[in-house]
Amino acid sequence: FNISGCSTKKLLWTYSTRSEEEFVLFCDLPEPQKSHFCHRNRLSPKQVPEHLPFMGSNDLSDVQWYQQPSNGDPLEDIRKSYPHIIQDKCTLHFLTPGVNNSGSYICRPKMIKSPYDVACCVKMILEVKPQTNASCEYSASHKQDLLLGSTGSISCPSLSCQSDAQSPAVTWYKNGKLLSVERSNRIVVDEVYDYHQGTYVCDYTQSDTVSSWTVRAVVQVRTIVGDTKLKPDILDPVEDTLEVELGKPLTISCKARFGFERVFNPVIKWYIKDSDLEWEVSVPEAKSIKSTLKDEIIERNIILEKVTQRDLRRKFVCFVQNSIGNTTQSVQLKEKRG
């Protein structure tokens, strides 16, 4: 097919010879609304931001990638000729760095369903260079770890030696999805969840007098666990009053989230406060209702065979504790009116 109508994008991959690195190309159709094919999805053209990775059809795997040989030979199907390059949906993954990856890569929809689709293609001219200057000794790694449950950050390797003030506007992607609000060379993650694990791509534009190109780096982010620094968090009950019917049985559930600890001795118990007295209630055993790498949610119920007038004067207190500290949540019973 004729590639002269394809939009063109120039990219630069500067790889470190010291570390293993990956690289990605998105089938990045810059103005989807110009092509009939490029917005055949659930979003209306007005809702598709420019420079989104290819979102052309409901099935993103129906994209074909080619490489254009430098000697002018016909386009080659990537999947057949390049074992170190993997196509995942609309993204092309380069598993190993090297100048031999330099070249022109073309993507377009597999299914041409209308005459307009012919021009729905992108040509990416990729230049790959080894990093030469060691001017930035502490540049960010292409593999970065985030400690689950804490605040962390993800730095763009190609810009990590620049201050935020000097840094150009950066475009970030996570697992191929544009993170439109992240624009600096460092993403601050307020609280790290396992969701934050993935492949991040940072792009910025570099120009000279002749042309401009996109400098791209890929960061593999892994989320790791450290011992919690937080006391447990009571998820339920949230309200401090509970409407009840006198004479009826009642179960009050206490659910608490305990952060990961290598030596884990969670405490979850109910006690009752009545004027100056307080006593622990023997209630059914606590049970774990959800366990993840980062935390565990434990539930313990208090069961009243029937609610009495006396219970309305009492406070039912859920007490939870780990090695960091404790949290309580009290519940006052209130008679249901009407």
Partner: antibody, heavy 119, light 111 residues
Framework: SLEESGGVLVKPGASLTLTCTAS?????????ICWVRQAPGKGLEWIAC????????TYYASWAKGRFTISKTSSTTVTLQMTSLTAADTATYFC?????????????WGPGTLVTVSS | DVVMTQTPASVSEPVGGTVSINCQAS??????LAWYQQKPGQPPKLLIY???NLASGVSSRFKGSGSGTEYTLTISDLECDDAATYYC?????????????FGGGTEVVVK
């Protein structure tokens, strides 16, 4: 509980600082504290949030950037500074705190404080 | 900012009926969505978080569903007390889970 204060009648062009005070709780690290406003008879409009943890990250609605500033001034107070006020800023201003493991939702709200901008 | 489009603006149903309120996000918000109920003169009350999780103390007549860009709040067996304005709210901002943009609201009238 949460309580907003500082809502008064001001003239267009004036500045105003609203305060959100927590009692019985503190703005501990796992929470976002946010300001939301509601013009008379209109819908809820998100203004800004601050993360109470170590990052102290702040987040603003695009229309609020530059004119509104959210700050955590102590473990129990968060403020919203507003400048160049216009009649369009007349609203009840609520502060809200995130909940449990779903920090991106707010289950604890103040009753609101009314700001009136009029000459 | 994400744009949250809520429909319908108003709906009227008899007691015992069912109401569905839709919320469309301008981009994939990955189920970081909450629903609130607000009555005149009161702050909003959280009903649903994470698109489908019922907040503590909320009646199971309220059901949240959806993913990606399309979300729905369904209220079944309508009661007079359900008359209120309902709002959806997006809860993701870049890589952080931050309460942010609201939908325009839906007024539910119970006949």
């Amino acid at each position: 509980s949460l309580e907003e204060s500082g809502g008064v009648l001001v003239k267009p062009g004036a500045s105003l600082t609203l305060t959100c005070t927590a009692s019985g709780i503190d703005f501990s690290s796992s929470y976002y504290i946010c300001w939301v406003r509601q013009a008379p008879g209109k819908g809820l409009e998100w203004i800004a949030c601050i993360y109470a943890g170590s990052s102290g990250s702040t987040y603003y609605a695009s229309w609020a950037k530059g004119r509104f500033t959210i700050s955590k001034t102590s473990s129990t107070t968060v403020t919203l500074q507003m400048t160049s006020l216009t009649a369009a800023d007349t609203a009840t201003y609520f502060c809200a705190r995130g909940t449990g493991s779903s920090h991106y939702t707010s289950n604890l709200w103040g009753p609101g404080t009314l700001v009136t901008v009029s000459s | 900012d994400v744009v949250m489009t809520q429909t319908p603006a108003s709906v009227s149903e008899p007691v015992g009926g069912t109401v569905s309120i839709n919320c469309q996000a301008s981009e994939d918000i990955e189920s970081y969505l909450a629903w609130y109920q607000q009555k005149p003169g009161q702050p909003p009350k959280l009903l649903i978080y994470g698109a489908s999780n019922l907040a503590s103390g909320v009646s199971s007549r309220f059901k949240g569903s959806g993913s990606g860009t399309e979300y729905t709040l369904t209220i079944s067996d309508l009661e007079c007390d359900d008359a209120a304005t309902y709002y959806c709210q997006c809860g993701i901002y870049g890589v952080n889970f931050v309460p942010n943009v609201f939908g325009g609201g839906t007024e539910v009238v119970v006949k």
